[in-house]
C-alpha cells in the first residue's frame, strides 16, 4: 500500500507527536525515522492514528528490526501489536510478565488470535514451564487456556501453579486434559483438610480413579450432581450404591433425572437391583435378583 | 463477545444539543478497543462518519462536524457518550456506536442504533 | 453527494454471480484500505470485508473484496436469496482527515 517516495520539504518528524495523524501513510513512511519511532514507542498509543497508519509504522519497524524487536520495544506497542503476525512473534524473545501483560490487555475485547496464541507459547517455552503467575496471568485473560493445552503441554504445568486455577478454567477441559490435572492438584492441596481439600479439588474430579471416589465418599462431602456427571465412567463403575449414596449425600435424588445419562445410566446397570431399591428413588435397570456377575475384566487379568 | 447499546431522546428540537450515550458490554471500555466510533444515518440516505474516540480520550472528528461535536469516555459507568449542538432538520438519523476490529479499521461491532428526530 | 460513488441499485438471480462497484480518488482508495459493509433492512451495518479483500470469522467465502488504482468492488457469489440488503463501501480518506462512505447499493435476488 505505501510507495517510497522522499519526504516534503518540512515534513520531516522531528519526534512522535500527534501532528503525524494529519501525514498520509507515503508521508509517514517517508517522513518518520525508524530510530526515532523505537525509542518513543511509548508515545505511539497516546497519538489517535488509525490502524493503517500502524500499519507504516510496523513497517518501518520491521526495516529497523529484521531479525526481531527488542523487549524494549514489545513491551511498548500497545496497540500496535494487533498488527502483528504469528511470523513476525516467532522472532521475538519476551522474558517479563510485565510486557505479556501488557500485549494480552490490549487483545482483550478480541478473541483469542493466532498471534496472541504464538506469544503465549513464546512466553511459555522461553521459561521452560508455566509457572504459577503465568498461568495466573493467562487464565485471568482467557479463562479457557488450561483446556486448550494438549495432555503433553499441561504436563510441564508444577502443581504449586494449580493454586492459580479457578474451576471457570476448566469448563471445557476434556477427560484426557483432566487426568493430567488431577493428580497435580492432589498434591498441591494434599495439606488441606477435608471439606476444603473437597472445595478445591472438585473441579478436577474428571481425573479422579475409583480409589480416590471411594476415599472421598467416606468424607461427607455431598457431591452435588453437576461434578457427579463429570467423572470418569470407568472411575464410577465399581463404586457400591452405599459409596455413591455417601459421595451426593443429600444430592443423591438427583440421580434420577439423570438416569438415562453417562456415568448414571452405565453405573445402574453394573448395580443389584435390589441395592438401587434402596435408595427409594425409582432407579430401574440394575441386575435382576438370583442373577450371577461375572466381572470378565478380573478373569482376564488372573489368565 | 462485546455489545453497544445507544440510548437518547427520540425528538429534538432545532437549536438543541443532542446528546447520546453507548454503553458497552462484555468489556471494558478502556481495554477492549482501540478505540470507539460514532456513525449516522439520515433516513434513507447514506452513512456518515461523525467521529472516533480513542482508548487514550483521543478524539478525531469529521471536519463538517467538528465545530459542534464533542466525545468522551466515561470509565467508571463503561460508555461513551456523543454531544451534537445547535442540532438542525438534516441532524435527523439514526445514531450508531460502532467498535473497529483487532488490528483493522472496519467496524466490526455495532451498536443497534437509536433514531434521533429533529422538529419544531 | 457523497465522496465514494456507487451504483444505486445492483440485481441478480439465485446462484449468479454479481459485483459491486465503488469509485473513488487518489485521496481515499487510491491511497488507502477499502471496508465493505451489508445492512439488512432495519438492522445495524455488517462488515463483510476490510483491508480490500480480507473476511471476518463468519463471514462465508461467497463473499470478496478487490481494488485496482482508485475503484474497488465487491463480489457475491452463489447469489442466495438472504444476500439481499444495502451495499456499503468505505476508506479512510487523506485530505478530508476521515472515514468515508458510499451511498450504498440495494441489491435485489430476483
Known amino acids: 500500500e505505501v510507495e517510497k517516495t522522499a519526504c516534503p520539504s518540512g515534513k520531516k518528524a522531528r519526534e512522535i507527536d500527534e501532528s503525524l495523524i494529519f501525514y498520509k501513510k507515503w508521508e509517514l513512511e517517508a517522513c518518520v525515522d525508524a530510530a526515532l519511532l523505537a525509542t518513543q514507542m511509548d508515545r505511539v498509543n497516546a497519538i489517535p492514528f488509525t490502524y493503517e497508519q500502524l500499519d507504516v509504522l510496523k513497517h518501518k519497524l520491521d526495516e529497523l528490526y529484521p531479525q526481531g524487536y527488542p523487549e524494549s520495544v514489545i513491551q511498548h506497542l500497545g496497540y500496535l501489536f494487533l498488527k502483528m503476525s504469528p511470523e513476525d512473534i516467532r522472532k521475538w524473545n519476551v522474558t517479563s510478565l510485565e510486557t505479556l501483560k501488557a500485549l494480552l490487555e490490549v487483545n482483550k475485547g478480541h478473541e483469542m488470535s493466532p498471534q496472541v496464541a504464538t506469544l503465549i507459547d513464546r512466553f511459555v517455552k522461553g521459561r521452560g514451564q508455566l509457572d504459577k503467575d503465568t498461568l495466573d496471568t493467562l487464565t485471568a485473560f482467557y479463562p479457557g487456556y488450561l483446556c486448550s493445552l494438549s495432555p503433553e503441554e499441561l504436563s510441564s504445568v508444577p502443581p504449586s501453579s494449580i493454586w492459580a486455577v479457578r474451576p471457570q478454567d476448566l469448563d471445557t477441559c476434556d477427560p484426557r486434559q483432566l487426568d493430567v490435572l488431577y493428580p497435580k492438584a492432589r498434591l498441591a492441596f494434599q495439606n488441606m483438610n477435608g471439606s476444603e481439600y473437597f472445595v478445591k479439588i472438585q473441579s478436577f474430579l474428571g481425573g479422579a480413579p475409583t480409589e480416590d471416589l471411594k476415599a472421598l465418599s467416606q468424607q461427607n462431602v455431598s457431591m452435588d450432581l453437576a461434578t457427579f456427571m463429570k467423572l470418569r465412567t470407568d472411575a464410577v463403575l465399581p463404586l457400591t450404591v452405599a459409596e455413591v449414596q455417601k459421595l451426593l449425600g443429600p444430592h443423591v435424588e438427583g440421580l434420577k433425572a439423570e438416569e438415562r445419562h453417562r456415568p448414571v445410566r452405565d453405573w445402574i446397570l453394573r448395580q443389584r437391583q435390589d441395592d438401587l431399591d434402596t435408595l427409594g428413588l425409582g432407579l430401574q435397570g440394575g441386575i435382576p435378583n438370583g442373577y450371577l456377575v461375572l466381572d470378565l475384566s478380573m478373569q482376564e487379568a488372573l489368565s | 463477545q462485546v455489545q453497544l447499546q445507544e440510548s437518547g431522546p427520540g425528538l429534538l428540537k432545532p437549536s438543541e444539543t443532542l446528546s447520546l450515550t453507548c454503553t458497552v458490554s462484555?468489556?471494558?471500555?478502556?481495554?477492549?478497543?482501540?478505540?470507539w466510533g460514532w456513525i449516522r444515518q439520515p433516513p434513507g440516505k447514506c452513512l456518515e462518519w461523525i467521529g472516533s474516540i480513542y482508548y487514550s480520550g483521543t478524539t478525531r472528528y469529521n471536519p463538517s462536524l467538528r465545530s459542534r461535536v464533542t466525545t468522551s469516555l466515561d470509565a467508571s459507568k463503561n460508555r461513551l457518550s456523543l454531544q451534537l449542538s445547535s442540532v438542525t432538520a438534516a441532524d435527523t438519523a439514526v445514531y450508531y456506536c460502532?467498535?473497529?476490529?483487532?488490528?483493522?479499521?472496519?467496524?466490526?461491532?455495532w451498536g443497534q442504533g437509536t433514531m434521533v428526530t429533529v422538529s419544531s | 453527494q457523497s465522496v465514494l460513488t456507487q451504483p444505486p441499485s445492483a440485481s441478480g438471480t439465485p446462484g449468479q454471480r454479481v459485483t459491486i462497484s465503488c469509485s473513488g480518488s487518489?485521496?481515499?482508495?487510491?491511497?488507502?484500505?477499502v471496508y465493505w459493509y451489508q445492512q439488512l433492512p432495519g438492522t445495524a451495518p455488517k462488515l463483510l470485508i476490510y483491508d480490500n479483500n480480507k473476511r471476518p470469522s463468519g463471514i462465508p467465502d461467497r463473499f470478496s473484496g478487490s481494488k485496482s488504482g482508485t475503484s474497488a468492488s465487491l463480489a457475491i457469489s452463489g447469489l442466495r436469496s438472504e444476500d439481499e440488503a444495502d451495499y456499503y463501501c468505505?476508506?479512510?480518506?487523506?485530505?478530508?482527515?476521515?472515514?468515508?462512505f458510499g451511498c450504498g447499493t440495494k441489491l435485489t435476488v430476483l
Open positions: 487518489s485521496s481515499n482508495i487510491g491511497s488507502n484500505y
Open positions: 462484555g468489556g471494558s471500555i478502556s481495554s477492549s478497543s482501540y478505540y
Open positions: 468505505a476508506a479512510w480518506d487523506d485530505s478530508l482527515s476521515g472515514w468515508v
Open positions: 460502532a467498535r473497529p476490529g483487532a488490528g483493522h479499521d472496519g467496524f466490526d461491532i
